[in-house]
């Protein structure tokens, strides 16, 4: 079958490239108990049916037990994300058992062969868990399987095969090829654990989607829409290299799921929140920043168990690096009237001023056309905590819909040089903070002067808490 063009094309080639691997027999899966944060510490290999290594390695039967499951590999050596995740788990849960599932012999294969091996690896993990359950004090409820890429589906198989129910499975950008649209018993699914949470960071609706697009857990979180991750663009990744490959971009976006999870472990004081939404476009419009009825949740390790709904899709924006947290705001701008607008589509820019800090000038992303005499909703986010918002500066520019319209504008201007300027009339801006759920209304500083021309500034000051009229009360919202 033809491979797609673009970044995925080269990776598609990699997926099907034969590899000469000298393996006489297929060895069993190994379970390496990481007894130290030190990456050079060998750890201990657990052996099914042999209790002595459990004692020798200090396996804590009553503590949480994490199983980290890697994915497909082209190198046959553990990538550094695994080292970071082991270290972060040890830092956060000092008494926990951290077990690295080493299935490199079965993963260092053609991608298609590695996929076919996921079932047998899942079965091996399930057998290990069944054996551990025979021990006093060991509880399956304390088991958390963390699978990256192909490893997420291995975790699904393990959860499916084990006698009983695993406490939690976290899927870190579960693999897409050969799993997209598959039957629930042939991929990670909500049935595989008491709580299944998933981070999707490399999904594509065109070409090859390295990560699975469909929701496969109780909650499925799509940072930055689940596709283009900040800091992973060609300029970001290749710009800093003397020589670079497109594979670096793919790796950056796919692996971002792991780093978001690590961030949630080590930056507990800076939790990132995701918000339930039916799709990415609605989220980009800023209409999904509600925390009512479990509609928002922390991401990664701090996610709260939500089993009431299946396949709850959640979205958030992030920074380009750790800590990934940003502060989301919904902005409702009522455009009362256009004046001499022609075919010009306005682009808004806001600067937010708060008690802690001021934002940069932020563009308001237009998902749909700006409606006249209607309330337009936008999503904005800042990397720093601004504190309580005090005022907003608004500007706009006209972006022509086409070269033809631009020419029409120019011709109109040349024929009527004294044509009155284009103006928008905006009297107030309503703001809702995603993180605090607080609603505020900002009114034009000069109520008599609410028209704004391109490039000019309009200032808005906080005029009331909430969005309702003064005689109405606003219900309080409990954050999760």
């Amino acid at each position: 079958s033809p491979t797609p063009f673009g970044p995925e094309g080269q990776l598609a080639d990699e997926l099907h490239k034969p590899k000469a691997i000298q393996t006489e027999v297929k060895p069993s899966v190994r379970f390496n108990l990481r007894t130290s944060k030190d990456p050079e510490h060998e750890g201990c290999y657990l052996s099914l049916g042999h209790s002595q290594p459990l004692e020798d390695c200090g396996f804590n039967m009553t503590a949480k037990t994490f199983f980290i499951i890697h994915g497909w590999t082209m190198s046959g050596i553990f990538e550094n994300w695994l080292h970071k995740l082991v270290s972060a788990l040890h830092t956060r849960e000092k008494d926990a058992n951290v077990v690295v599932v080493d299935w490199l012999p079965l993963a260092h294969q053609l991608y298609t062969d590695a996929v076919n091996n996921t079932r047998v690896v899942g079965h091996s993990i399930a057998r290990m868990l069944d054996w551990l359950q025979e021990k006093d004090d060991f509880s399956l409820g304390n088991v958390h399987l963390i699978g990256y890429s192909l490893g997420a589906h291995v975790a699904g198989y393990a959860g499916n095969f084990v006698k009983g129910t695993v406490g939690r499975i976290t899927g870190l950008d579960p693999a897409g090829p050969m799993f997209e649209g598959a039957d629930i018993h042939k991929r990670l699914s909500p049935d595989d654990a008491d709580f299944v949470d998933v981070l999707h960071t490399y999904t594509r609706s065109f070409g090859l989607s390295i990560g699975i697009q469909m929701p496969v857990g109780h909650i499925d979180i799509y940072p930055n829409g689940g596709d283009f991750q900040p800091g992973c663009g060609l300029n970001d990744v290749l710009g800093s290299m003397a020589y670079g490959t497109i594979t670096e971009v793919v790796k950056c976006e796919h692996e971002r799921a792991v780093h978001l999870f690590v961030d949630s472990l080590v930056n507990q004081d800076k939790p990132s929140f995701a918000f339930q939404c039916t799709d990415s476009n609605r989220f980009k419009k800023g209409i999904c920043l509600s925390c009512r009825k479990n509609r928002c949740n922390s991401i990664g390790y701090n996610a709260k168990k939500m089993r009431n709904k299946r396949n709850s899709k959640m979205y958030l924006k992030t920074r380009a690096g750790m800590p990934f947290r940003v502060y989301h705001y919904q902005m409702k701008i009522h455009v009362f009237s256009y004046k001499n607008m022609g075919e010009i589509e306005p682009t808004f820019y806001v600067t937010l001023y708060g008690t802690n800090a001021d934002s940069q000038t932020l563009p308001l992303e237009i998902v749909e056309r700006i409606e006249q005499n209607a309330t337009n909703t936008f999503l904005v986010y800042t990397e720093e905590d601004l504190g309580d918002l005090l005022k907003i500066q608004l500007t706009w520019e006209g972006a022509s819909q086409s070269w033809y319209n631009l020419w029409k504008e120019l011709r109109s201007y040349l024929s009527q040089p004294h044509n009155p300027g284009r103006e928008l009339n905006i009297r107030r801006i309503r703001v809702k903070s995603g993180e605090t759920q607080r609603k505020l209304t900002f009114c034009a500083e000069d109520p008599e002067n609410t028209s704004i021309s391109p490039g000019r500034e309009l200032w808005f000051r906080k005029c009331r808490d909430g969005w309702r009229m003064k005689n109405e009360t606003s219900p309080t919202v409990e954050l999760p």
Partner: antibody, heavy 120, light 107 residues
Framework: QVQLVQSGAEVKKPGASVKVSCKAS????????IHWVRQAPGQGLEWMGH????????NNNEKFKDRVTMTRDTSISTAYMELSRLRSDDTAVYYC?????????????WGQGTTVTVSS | DIQMTQSPSSLSASVGDRVTITCRAS??????LNWYQQKPGKAPKLLIS???KLHSGVPSRFSGSGSGTDFTLTISSLQPEDFATYYC?????????FGQGTKLEIK
């Protein structure tokens, strides 16, 4: 204590092949990866590739493409590196080195080196 | 491939001197930087891993620092046995690459 002992010096003609061995002791052979690094006379160090002795999976530096073959024999805790189609610029000291299970792990123990001279 | 550039290529110093060798990577290597010492006719020896972690048996006069793309190896008070060639190596991305080396000679 950890030790990596390599085979003796070799003199080869251009176009021939050379096979260098590296015997490990003092640790569990299958718990670490074995890497091959070479050093041309008066030059720096160049990574050639590695083998995971646990199952024999290898990964080579693209520079050596199909010329390098790495194998191992777990029964005698020995890793091998064969370089084919030798050229005069392959004259170098070839080292095996032990590395932990991560990319980031350092080469913590090295063999004494095997001098390979390619000359007609 | 990630390029590792060491400076200086060579330097002369006296016993008791404080010496600094720098290593620059062509991209961020997430602190996955190791330092080795090599004496003529011998195999390299690990000094420091993960930017600053001293390998067992290595004297405390050796120290490492840095982040992102710029790293430093410091010898606080040179001893006669420290005259050798020093190499940095990145462990962030395959293929693993080394600096070209810094030869430390007696003044």
């Amino acid at each position: 204590q950890v030790q990596l002992v390599q085979s003796g010096a070799e003199v080869k003609k251009p176009g021939a092949s050379v096979k260098v061995s590296c015997k490990a002791s003092g640790y569990t052979f299958t718990d670490n990866t074995i890497h091959w690094v070479r050093q041309a006379p008066g030059q720096g160090l160049e990574w050639m590739g590695h083998i995971n002795p646990y199952y024999g999976g290898t990964n080579n530096n693209e520079k050596f493409k199909d010329r390098v073959t790495m194998t191992r024999d777990t029964s005698i805790s020995t890793a091998y590196m064969e370089l084919s189609r030798l050229r005069s610029d392959d004259t170098a000291v070839y080292y095996c080195a032990r590395k932990g299970i991560y990319y980031s792990s350092p080469f913590d123990y090295w063999g004494q080196g095997t001098t390979v001279t390619v000359s007609s | 491939d990630i390029q590792m550039t060491q400076s200086p290529s060579s330097l002369s110093a006296s016993v008791g001197d404080r010496v600094t060798i720098t290593c620059r990577a062509s991209q961020d290597i997430n602190n996955y930087l190791n330092w080795y010492q090599q004496k003529p006719g011998k195999a390299p020896k690990l000094l420091i891993s993960y930017t600053s972690k001293l390998h067992s048996g290595v004297p405390s006069r050796f120290s490492g620092s840095g982040s992102g793309t710029d790293f430093t190896l410091t010898i606080s008070s040179l001893q006669p046995e420290d005259f050798a060639t020093y190499y940095c190596q990145q462990g962030n991305t395959l293929p693993f690459t080394f600096g070209q080396g810094t030869k430390l000679e007696i003044k």
